[in-house]
């Protein structure tokens, strides 16, 4: 249904959907601060460009679109049904920022006119891929999947001389929203990851995971899981682990590995951590004062959503083009804009590109060290540490199949 928009005559409004238990359990006040900081920057940039317009945000709050579990899986169509009615009963802004939950976004996308752009801090699932008017400012599952396949196939690095074609995936259903969708994508039988692997089994019980660690008959040495080091410790504890096991811990939105005083615990020695390259200016920003390292990315995505809107608004106004058109709604992709923490690149489908970083634990220093980086924009891996001090034999990653390669 066509939505009436507050989006003309020099006055441009952003509708911001604030959901109590969204993709990350971030206090709404922090998100408000991020949005307001973004608005200040946008106003300044427009003024500097000689554009005398007003830009504001209207917040709409939901405290039950998703339930108390703090996840988005129960994010129901009734919440979206309600939001659609509200949208049709009153004028919305030029753009909707939120929702962050995959189920919500997918349903809203089906229910919304394509002339209405949506910017999401989340919506990680594959069901939100390739949506013409949806922009995602946090790495979606597709990007993770492409990294993993690229890394599995790599066999020409000093520390990885074998292509891998197998994996276990640990997924017990208690994951955070980002992890849930990342692992869902890996589990899906019809996906790039599944297509490229010869063997893949999902471990759903703690005991299954624990048994694999020392099982001589295991079908793969590689286990993918998602979460932080504490999550892994709860599961693995101090159990013995076969020396050719490699655990890939996906923990994209966590800066703590890069902090100076962090020492890797002993249980992390068999683990490669996949995370995002950290930002550089957030530590001193006013909006992030109260944010934990794991929450910065979520608030930053809201802020960058505002800056992205400002970027597009500036371009369209300078070209004398109408904002309330399908052209505007479809324009939030295949571009680079000045984000809060540096340039932000969006791919052809409006999904953020980033530098992923694979870390290992140095047996010498007990510190996390960068093994390689991966540029999601060009789907390319760049080795960083050519002679890593691994726990694995000969400082090389083992073959993924037991009984072959360095043991």
């Amino acid at each position: 249904s066509q939505v009436s928009q507050n989006c003309h005559n020099g006055s441009y409004e952003i509708s911001v959907l604030m959901m109590g238990n969204s993709a990350f359990a971030e206090p709404l006040k922090n998100l408000e601060d991020a949005v307001n900081e973004g608005l200040e920057i946008v106003r300044g940039r427009l003024q500097n460009a000689g554009l005398n317009v007003t830009v504001n945000a209207t917040f709409m709050y939901s405290d039950g679109l998703i339930h108390n579990s703090g996840d988005c899986r129960s994010s129901t169509c009734e919440g979206l049904d309600l939001l659609r009615k509200i949208s049709n009963a009153q004028r919305m802004g030029c753009v909707l920022i939120g929702p962050s939950c995959t189920y919500s976004t997918f349903q809203m996308y089906l229910d919304t006119e394509l002339s209405y752009p949506m910017i999401s801090a989340g919506s990680f699932g594959l069901s939100c891929d390739y949506k013409e008017t949806l922009t995602r400012l946090m790495s979606p599952a597709r990007k993770l999947m492409y990294f993993l396949v690229n890394f599995w196939k790599t066999n020409d690095l000093p520390f990885k001389t074998y292509s891998w074609s197998t994996s276990y995936v640990y997924k017990n259903g208690t994951e955070t929203e980002d992890c849930f969708w990342y692992l869902n994508a890996l589990e899906a039988s019809v996906s790039y990851f599944s297509h490229e692997l010869g063997f893949k089994v999902v471990l759903r019980q703690d005991k299954e995971f624990q048994d694999i660690l020392m099982d001589h008959n295991r079908k793969s040495n590689v286990i993918i899981m998602c979460g932080g080091p504490e999550f892994l410790y709860k599961l693995k504890g101090d159990r013995a682990v076969a020396e050719d096991i490699v655990i890939i811990l996906v923990d994209l939105f966590n800066d703590q590995y890069f902090e100076d005083n962090v020492t890797a615990p002993d249980y992390m020695k068999n683990v490669l951590v996949l995370t995002l390259s950290p930002g550089n200016s957030l530590l001193n920003s006013s909006f992030s004062r109260n944010l934990s390292p794991t929450k910065r990315d979520f608030a930053l995505a809201y802020l960058n959503g505002i800056l992205l809107f400002g970027h597009m608004l500036k371009i369209f106004l300078e070209n004398g083009e109408n904002i309330t058109t399908p052209k505007f709604a479809h324009a939030f992709r295949n571009l680079t804009f000045e984000g809060y923490d540096g340039p932000v690149t969006l791919d052809d489908w409006g999904d953020v590109d980033s530098t992923m970083v694979l870390l290992y634990t140095s047996v010498d220093t007990k510190k996390y060290k960068v093994l390689l980086t991966y540029d999601t924009h060009v789907n390319k891996t760049y080795p960083v540490d050519m002679s890593p001090t691994f726990t694995w034999k000969n400082s090389k990653l083992p073959n993924d199949i037991t009984g072959r390669g360095p043991q």
Epitope: S1, G64, E78, G79, D81, K85, N88, A89
Partner: nanobody, 119 residues
Framework: EVQLVESGGGLVQAGGSLRLSCAAS????????MGWFRQAPGKEREFVAA????????FYAHSVKGRFTISRDNAKNTVYLQMNSLKPEDTAVYSC????????????WGQGTQVTVSS
């Protein structure tokens, strides 16, 4: 569509409270999303709060968040708007709206009830 009748409006001093009710006719009330909107003289209609059919999902406008609470009693076919810490700028005609699940709009609207907040 359901018929909607609002009540509970009136004159109240700033800082005071009011509770608006919206009674609905019809046996499928629990499948209807309900909302409260308001319109002050010379201004556009403004969204206030809304609640899903089960009551599990609520939305609030920024201007009323923390002061107003929407709720519903499906056994009584009634939706409520509890308004606390009222301000003069809350003065408006408050209308209740309902829409069947799956329809894109609030298809039913009440006549409205006047709320006046004096300073």
């Amino acid at each position: 569509e359901v018929q909607l009748v609002e009540s509970g409006g009136g004159l109240v001093q700033a800082g005071g409270s009011l509770r608006l009710s919206c009674a609905a006719s019809g046996r499928t009330f629990s499948s209807y999303a309900m909302g409260w909107f308001r319109q002050a003289p010379g201004k556009e209609r403004e969204f206030v709060a809304a609640i899903s059919g089960s009551g599990g999902v609520t939305f609030y406008a920024h201007s009323v968040k923390g002061r107003f609470t929407i709720s519903r009693d499906n056994a009584k076919n009634t939706v409520y708007l509890q308004m606390n810490s009222l301000k003069p700028e809350d003065t408006a005609v408050y209308s209740c709206a309902g829409g069947a699940h799956g329809s894109p709009d609030f298809g039913s609207w009440g006549q409205g009830t006047q709320v006046t907040v004096s300073s």
